[in-house]
Interface confidence: low
């Protein structure tokens, strides 16, 4: 990563974590930390789609994108998107959805990220190639099996011994100005909604946890993971792997995706296993839709609002939750490994689906649009633009509806894979997000 | 090659029920979102609603929510559209689009070259 | 409200450039778009998604004459050297909080 997207990723992380909804009271200021940045480029250099099982007492996210370079503001926005399937009161994640990313985010207690991106010609675990792997370590780790990521209240209320308020987040009293932090580049700061439950950036959709224990940290699996129980992840359609150690996506070949689309990938986090380990059912492997999107001008713009999940690059987040294995095996289209790890398409929704806006303004339009004759023939569409793919977990018991979302990767927390892989999520420049 | 072939359309009356499908090939069909957009004659596009990768999720337009149900069998690689209490304003060629995302944004690419759907008594 | 505004017609010489504009409701200037081409008698077709920056990601297929680009909460669709073929409907759309969102369309027309 380059010296601004390493202090873009730091302060967009800060602004997120400054805006949550509803405010914390004891969210840290966070910063970077070039140990757990050169752990994480040591472990994007092996080019494997899945969490690091060494990774030891560090959370982690992970975000892939192909064909167009890495992009600090969207692989942020990937993992946020998920904070509309999240939460807070409850600690939960909606069913078959990804939270682990977004709550490994604004998780209170980490105060130090490092990250490191290395483009893969080949991923280990998917079928794209030329991606660029970005993983972000966390320390202390987020996703603690019980806990919520902050505790709800008056910005700054609860801030630790030896920390002062700053712009909402507590920092550390007399550490000097971090360098690394940006000056909030996001022209449009995200305005989000008052509750996370329902909160989802305004283009997108995000995740939440279970009551009390984020859902995707559910140790038992109940019920089958039906078709129609898993969730699909948005444009945004992730997965996320569950394992009780970070699986690998490259257990078994992953599934192979048959549309080419070039295409994003993010990983979600894992939840940390401070406590018991959690288990998950066994995972099949989705196959990987590829999207073959051209993107022109792309200019690397750090002010992209974190509010706009409808990035050109679509990107997919998961929810962290498992799925029981009927539905994983429904959604996956290719066998999944052995592995505690479930791969559901799943696609948040990006808002209750109940509220509907006009979708047309036809005022003062009058001219007169002619249909198109409808052939008996198989009509044919060529795939086009980019699309994103995303890989998206569940726990176990997750079935539930699931919403539209961005797969944004990978998330794990130290020493266990969470989520296992919902589903492949494709997307505008595809994003390819899962949960490991 | 990404194919979406709708069938289902025809007339019907109003307040009578219809069902559209979308058969889909080249691609994965279940990690996709699925969409069905309308275009009244003469009109534009009007989005009616979505259904995720797994079919877990589903958003519809006010326009026809509580009467129209999207559903999807991943098994067949195809989405179905269930209209009932049909009006004459549903009129209208139906587009069956495949997201570009699972996250079903509701970028829609490809489309359907459609089937038209007439209310009429 | 999400709100996507296009004007009805336009119209451009063959050959010349012609700029379409979807202008985003108040509050929404941060939206990306999509931009889909209906020629006559035809299916919608994708052309690309053009974010808030500028930045876009045409679909396969789509000519170089087609770019995007963006100015607050305005979303242009610029074709270049406006080719006969290019005579068609052009809607923008985006995707607002669990609803899809079509602007009314342009139509148009190569002189």
């Known amino acids: 990563l380059t010296d601004e997207e390493k202090r873009l990723m730091v302060e967009l992380h800060n602004l997120y974590r400054a805006q949550v909804s509803p405010t914390a009271s004891d969210m840290l200021h966070m910063r970077w930390d070039e140990e757990l940045a050169a752990f994480a480029k040591a472990y994007a250099r092996q080019c494997v789609w899945g969490h690091n099982k060494e990774r030891g007492r560090r959370g982690e996210n992970l975000f892939a994108i192909t064909d167009e370079g890495m992009d600090v503001p969207l692989a942020m926005e990937e993992w946020h998107h998920e904070r509309e399937h999240y939460n807070l009161s409850a600690a939960t994640c909606s069913p078959g959805q990804m939270c682990g990313h977004y709550t490994q985010v604004v998780w209170a207690k980490t105060e130090r990220i490092g990250c490191g991106s290395h483009f893969c010609e080949k991923l280990q675990g998917v079928e794209e190639t030329n991606i660029e792997l970005l993983v972000c370590n966390y320390e202390p780790p987020g996703n603690v099996k019980g806990k919520r990521p902050y505790q709800e209240g008056t910005p700054c209320s609860q801030c630790p011994s030896g920390y002062h308020c700053k712009n909402s987040l507590c920092e550390p009293i007399g550490s000097p100005e971090d360098a690394q932090d940006l000056p909030y580049l996001v022209t449009e700061a995200p305005s989000f909604r008052a509750t996370e439950a329902s909160d989802s950036r305004k283009m997108g959709t995000p995740s939440s946890l279970a009551t009390g224990i984020p859902a995707f940290l559910v140790t038992e699996v109940s019920g089958s993971l039906a078709t129609k129980a898993l969730p699909a992840v948005e444009t945004q359609a992730p997965t996320s792997l569950a394992t009780k150690d970070p699986p690998s996506m490259a257990t078994e070949a992953p599934p192979c995706v048959t549309t080419e689309v070039p295409s994003i990938l993010a990983a979600h986090s894992l939840p940390s296993l401070d406590e018991e380990p959690v288990t998950f059912p066994k995972s099949t492997h989705v196959p990987i839709p590829k999207s073959a999107d051209k993107v022109t001008d792309k200019t690397k713009v750090p002010s992209r609002s974190p509010e706009n999940s409808l990035d050109p690059k679509m990107s997919l987040t998961g929810a962290r939750e498992l799925l029981p294995h009927a539905q994983e095996e429904a959604e996956a289209e290719a066998e999944l490994p052995p592995s505690s790890e479930v791969l559901a398409s799943v696609f948040p929704a990006q808002d209750k689906p109940g509220e509907l806006q006009a979708t047309l303004d036809h005022t003062g339009h009058t001219s007169s649009k002619s249909l198109p004759n409808f052939p008996n023939t198989s009509a044919t569409a060529n795939a086009t633009g980019g699309r994103a793919l995303a890989l998206q977990s569940s726990l176990p018991g997750a079935e539930g509806p699931d919403k539209p979302s961005v797969v944004s990767g990978l998330n794990s927390g130290p020493g266990h894979v969470w989520g296992p892989l919902l589903g492949l999520l494709l997307l505008p420049p595809l994003v390819l997000a899962g949960i490991f | 090659e990404v194919q979406l072939l709708e069938s289902g359309g025809g007339l019907v009356q109003p307040g009578g029920s219809l069902r559209v499908s979308c058969a889909a090939s080249g691609f994965t069909f279940s990690s996709y979102a699925m969409s069905w957009v309308r275009q009244a004659p003469g009109k534009g596009l009007e989005w009616v609603s979505t259904?995720?990768?797994?079919?877990?999720?589903?958003h519809y337009a006010d326009s026809v929510k509580g009467r129209f149900t999207i559903s999807r069998d991943n098994s067949k690689n195809t989405v179905y559209m269930q209209m009932s209490s049909l009006r004459a304003e549903d009129t209208a060629a139906y587009y069956c689009?495949?997201?570009?995302?699972?996250?079903?944004?509701?970028?829609?690419?490809?489309w359907g070259q459609g089937t038209l759907v007439t209310v009429s008594s | 409200q999400l709100v996507l505004t296009q004007s009805p017609s336009a119209s451009a010489s063959l050959g010349a450039s012609v700029k379409l504009t979807c202008t985003l409701s108040?509050?929404?200037?941060?939206?990306?778009i999509a931009w889909h081409q209906q020629q006559p008698e035809k299916g919608p077709r994708y052309l690309m998604k053009?974010?808030?920056?500028?930045?876009?990601s045409k679909g396969d297929g789509i000519p170089d004459r087609f770019s995007g680009s963006s100015s607050g909460a305005e979303r242009y669709l610029t074709i270049s050297s406006l080719q006969s073929e290019d005579e068609a409907d052009y809607y923008c759309q985006t995707w607002g909080t669990g609803i899809a969102v079509f602007g009314g369309g342009t139509q148009l027309t190569p002189l």
């Open positions: 053009l974010n808030s920056d500028g930045s876009h």
């Open positions: 689009a495949k997201d570009l995302g699972l996250r079903a944004q509701g970028w829609f690419d490809p």
């Open positions: 259904i995720s990768g797994s079919g877990g999720t589903t």
């Open positions: 108040s509050g929404h200037s941060s939206y990306a």
